[in-house]
Interface confidence: medium
């Protein structure tokens, strides 16, 4: 992994995790009845929901071949394979889609080899005794005077690479999407490369993660494409790579809307929701953790 | 000093290719995102091509597409465009222009620095 | 491709006098515009980007205004040195389409 030095690994899971292979996340989809029933709400993004001893095991069973083809994250985040993607996305469960297919940024140590292993970009810092918790790769600096979470994001060195983020602003880079998340404290997201233009859905791009994915008028986007296709499916216009998490975008030409053709196993709109059919029962006040 | 300098224009005959250079100096050229644009005798401005600052991602006007190929070396500060299939209706002064790439976190746009230009004369 | 037009082409003004150009975008591009003035002879130089951003070192009598498919320069009170051909460029595609130019000449 060749992360930047400072140069964060994009947002993350919703909870603290190290660098390890098990994040554990006492808060997570807890249910207070006596049964913990395994469903696609408690254990997303292709992991399988296992009994563990006294608990409940999110298992991430992804064995990603090591082919470098790389695929830029809506996190920031390069990956060294779409695989790798995946797993990450299970790992830290949170919903990670392709934007791009090769990097995110080409400069040396600007991109992260496998983006998971650099820890999740909402990682929460622990020494926060006058901070609160510093989210988002930001330190907390006791000593200062007016004291707060400091970021020490360096994006200087980086080349132009225009992305337009969930807030709605276009940055000159995706490190400055990481740096912005750091300095406001919030979770901001890439959701396409290139700078937002007037055809982005600005009702998504407003709003905070919401789980809600970039997802432009599609009918302006697809007057874009060169190609012109006479049938009534078409592929998606490249802006809407990643809109189908596990399956294939098409968009249908007479109702101008992009649909997804979800690979076998899984379903929701976006196929991002994994079909499950056993239920798992265990004792109550037991915590639910992913590996 | 930040400049741009382009160079290998001329007289071409139809049909016949050409390169231009242009030369950077006075800022990092690596980071920043760089385009050519043309201006005929006489008439306005026409954007031709722009490549990113990684040389992976390029975008052409319609008229040059096919024919026209723009890249760059960033181990020499320098931007080319490679013109095949040169006809008349290319004459033009070609201008080489940095991408507006700014100080801050947020994408500005525009050209913030052109070159002199170079010209292009493409007769029989 | 996004086409945009200029108006008026030619404008005849005087020293001290305030000026408006206008362009119009054939669709929307938020405010993904920029002004450039360009003399004789001369490479273009950047006046205004996103709409209505100042580029750093141009006179503060020169301004921008508009966005979706309506914007104007504005130059408050004209001095000898602003007389010279103006044009708009729009960047909201991946396909830069500049207006055709306003010639700004001495009444």
């Known amino acids: 992994s060749n992360q930047p030095p400072g140069g964060g690994g994009g947002s993350g899971g919703d909870c603290p995790g190290g660098k390890g292979k098990s994040i554990n996340c006492s808060e997570l989809n807890v249910r207070e009845s006596d049964v913990r029933v395994c469903d696609e709400s408690s254990c997303k993004y292709g992991g399988v929901c296992k009994e563990d001893g006294d608990g409940l095991k999110c298992a991430c069973q992804f064995q990603c071949h090591t082919n470098y083809i790389p695929v830029c994250g809506s996190n920031g985040d390069t990956y060294q394979n779409e695989c790798f993607l995946r797993r990450a996305a299970c790992k830290h469960q949170k919903e990670i889609t392709v934007i791009a297919r090769g990097p995110c940024y080409s400069d040396n140590g600007s991109g992260s080899g496998e983006g998971e292993e650099e820890g999740s970009g909402a990682e929460v810092h622990r020494k926060h005794s006058k901070c609160g918790p510093c989210k988002y790769k930001a330190e907390c600096d006791e000593d200062a005077e007016n004291v707060g979470c400091v970021c020490n994001i360096d994006c200087s060195g980086y080349s132009f690479n225009p992305v337009c983020a969930s807030d709605g602003s276009s940055y000159n880079n995706p490190c400055f999407v990481r740096e912005a998340s750091c300095i406001k404290q919030e979770q901001i997201d890439i959701r396409h490369l290139g700078h937002c233009t007037d055809t982005d859905d600005t009702s998504l791009l407003g709003k905070k993660d919401d789980g809600l994915q970039y997802r432009p008028d599609v009918k302006d986007a697809s007057d874009q494409r060169e190609d012109v296709y006479i049938g009534n499916h078409m592929p998606c216009p490249e802006n809407l790579n990643g809109y189908c998490i596990h399956g294939k975008c098409e968009f249908i030409y007479s109702t101008q809307k992009a649909s997804c053709r979800c690979e076998s196993g899984y379903t929701g709109q976006h196929c991002e929701k994994t079909d499950f059919s056993i239920l798992y029962v265990v004792p109550s006040r037991q915590k639910l953790t992913h590996v | 000093q930040v400049l741009l300098v382009e160079s290998g224009g001329g007289v071409v005959q139809p049909g016949r290719s050409l390169r231009l250079s242009c030369a950077a100096s006075?800022?990092?050229?690596?980071?920043?995102?760089m385009h050519w644009v043309r201006q005929a005798p006489g008439r306005g401005l026409e954007w031709v091509a722009v490549?990113?600052?990684?040389?992976?991602?390029?975008h052409y006007a319609d008229s040059v597409k096919g024919r026209f190929t723009i890249s760059r070396d960033n181990s020499k500060n320098t931007l080319y465009l490679q013109m095949n299939s040169l006809r008349a209706e290319d004459t033009a002064v070609y201008y080489c222009?940095?991408?507006?790439?700014?100080?801050?976190?947020?994408?500005?746009?525009?050209?913030?620095?052109w070159g002199q230009g170079t010209t292009v004369t493409v007769s029989s | 491709d996004i086409q945009m037009t200029q108006s008026p082409s030619t404008l005849s003004a005087s020293v001290g006098d305030r000026v408006t150009i206008t362009c119009r975008a054939s669709?929307?591009?938020?405010?993904?515009l920029a002004w450039y003035q360009q003399k004789p002879g001369k490479a273009p130089k950047l006046l205004i980007y996103?709409?209505?951003s100042l580029e750093s070192g141009v006179p503060s009598r020169f301004s921008g205004s508009g966005s979706g498919t309506e914007f104007t320069l504005t130059i408050s009170s004209l001095q000898p040195d602003d007389f010279a051909t103006y044009y708009c460029?729009?960047?909201?595609?991946?396909?830069?389409?500049f207006g055709q130019g306003t010639k700004l000449e001495i009444k």
């Open positions: 006075g800022f990092t050229f690596k980071r920043y995102g």
């Open positions: 669709q929307s591009i938020s405010s993904w």
């Open positions: 490549i990113w600052s990684d040389g992976n991602k390029k």
């Open positions: 460029q729009q960047y909201n595609s991946y396909s830069w389409t």
């Open positions: 222009a940095r991408e507006n790439y700014g100080s801050g976190s947020y994408y500005n746009g525009g050209m913030d620095v």
């Open positions: 996103k709409a209505s």
